[in-house]
């Protein structure tokens, strides 16, 4: 099956930049987001620190670490209230992602 221009293969994601006007200085500001073409039963999430299609049950239950959001060799922990997760690098640096 051939993909049309701008069409994503099933189960894949890409990062897109959305421009919107304007801040108080009339500057165009941008927001980056992921665009995913997920299969049935999947939803946009994060795997190995990249946008990915993940099992929708993970999102519903907020078991974020089941997405394997951190890099290999890093530890994953849920934030209090399951509002996101932290990835702990081998040397102890932490990276926190909150889900809005």
């Amino acid at each position: 099956q051939f993909l049309k221009e701008g069409q994503l293969a099933a189960g894949t994601c890409e990062i897109v930049t959305l421009d919107r006007c304007c801040n108080k200085n009339r500057r165009t500001i941008a927001r980056q987001t992921a665009r995913c073409a997920c299969r049935k039963g999947q939803i946009a999430g994060t795997t190995r620190a990249r946008p990915a299609c993940v099992d929708a049950r993970i999102i519903k239950t907020k078991q974020w670490c089941d997405m394997l959001p951190c890099l290999e060799g890093e530890g994953c922990d849920l934030l209090i209230n399951r509002s996101g997760w932290t990835c702990t690098q081998p040397g102890g640096r932490i990276k926190t992602t909150t889900v809005s």
Epitope: T86, Q89, P90, G91, G92, R93, I94
Partner: antibody
Framework: QEQLVESGGRLVTPGTTLTLTCTVS????????VSWVRQAPGKGLEWIGY??????PHYASWAKGRFTISKTSSTTVDLKMTSLTTEDTATYFC?????????WGPGTLVTVSS | ELDLTQTPSSVSAAVGGTVTINCQAS????????LAWYQQKPGQPPKLLIY???TLASGVSSRFKGSGSGTQFTLTISDVQCDDAATYYC?????????????FGGGTELEIL
């Protein structure tokens, strides 16, 4: 709103020990790391060290021994500096260190002069 | 010793022009992409522009573009505006277990003609 504010900067004489405090609001120190960075007048940014909850602090190689970073409460991180010299004259910033350093505090000025 | 070399140290550009700033690390940054760019104006703390080499920080204009991986990174500012006059810094993250966690480049001063 996520905010950091540094305090404790002042004019001191060489050899003094000084402790700066970074007070955070709008986010939890149990979930985020904090870095201390300094900037001498007219110079560039210099990373001093980093602390994350439940982990030992990490320091720039030049800062080891004379600088100590500690989490002193659920909302404060201290930077203790000993044997200060005129070379330590700078604005000291703390910043939430996550995906990049953001946000930053406004900074506190430390002047070391005899 | 960890080192981030930023070039050039100063650059001039006309309004509407394009500026490119380079940052070279003495060793690969963590995950090959943990590099950030900041803008700093006199009397202010630095402002995060880009993290993870190419991801725009919230509310930053898409005129700022980051690229690169490993040890070589670039910040490109297109359609330069008067408000872009500032000093720009790169900051690399490294594994805390083996070296300094962070290092900054020496800065690039952008002057608008």
């Amino acid at each position: 709103q996520e905010q950091l504010v540094e305090s404790g900067g002042r004019l001191v004489t060489p050899g003094t020990t000084l402790t700066l405090t970074c007070t955070v609001s709008g986010f939890s120190l149990s979930s985020y790391g904090v870095s201390w960075v300094r900037q001498a007048p007219g110079k560039g940014l210099e990373w001093i060290g980093y602390i994350a909850n439940n982990y030992n602090p990490h320091y720039a190689s030049w800062a080891k021994g004379r600088f100590t970073i500690s989490k002193t409460s659920s909302t404060t991180v201290d930077l203790k500096m000993t044997s200060l010299t005129t070379e330590d004259t700078a604005t000291y910033f703390c910043a939430r260190d996550n995906y990049g350093m953001d946000p930053w505090g406004p900074g506190t000025l430390v002047t070391v002069s005899s | 010793e960890l080192d981030l070399t930023q070039t050039p140290s100063s650059v001039s550009a006309a309004v509407g022009g394009t500026v490119t700033i380079n940052c070279q690390a003495s060793q690969s940054v963590y995950n090959n992409k943990n590099l950030a760019w900041y803008q700093q104006k006199p009397g202010q703390p630095p402002k995060l522009l880009i993290y993870a080499a190419s991801t725009l920080a919230s509310g930053v204009s898409s005129r700022f573009k980051g690229s690169g991986s490993g040890t070589q990174f670039t910040l490109t500012i297109s359609d330069v505006q008067c408000d872009d006059a500032a000093t720009y810094y790169c900051q690399g993250e490294f594994s805390c277990s083996s070296a300094d966690c962070n290092a900054f480049g020496g800065g690039t001063e952008l002057e608008i003609l």
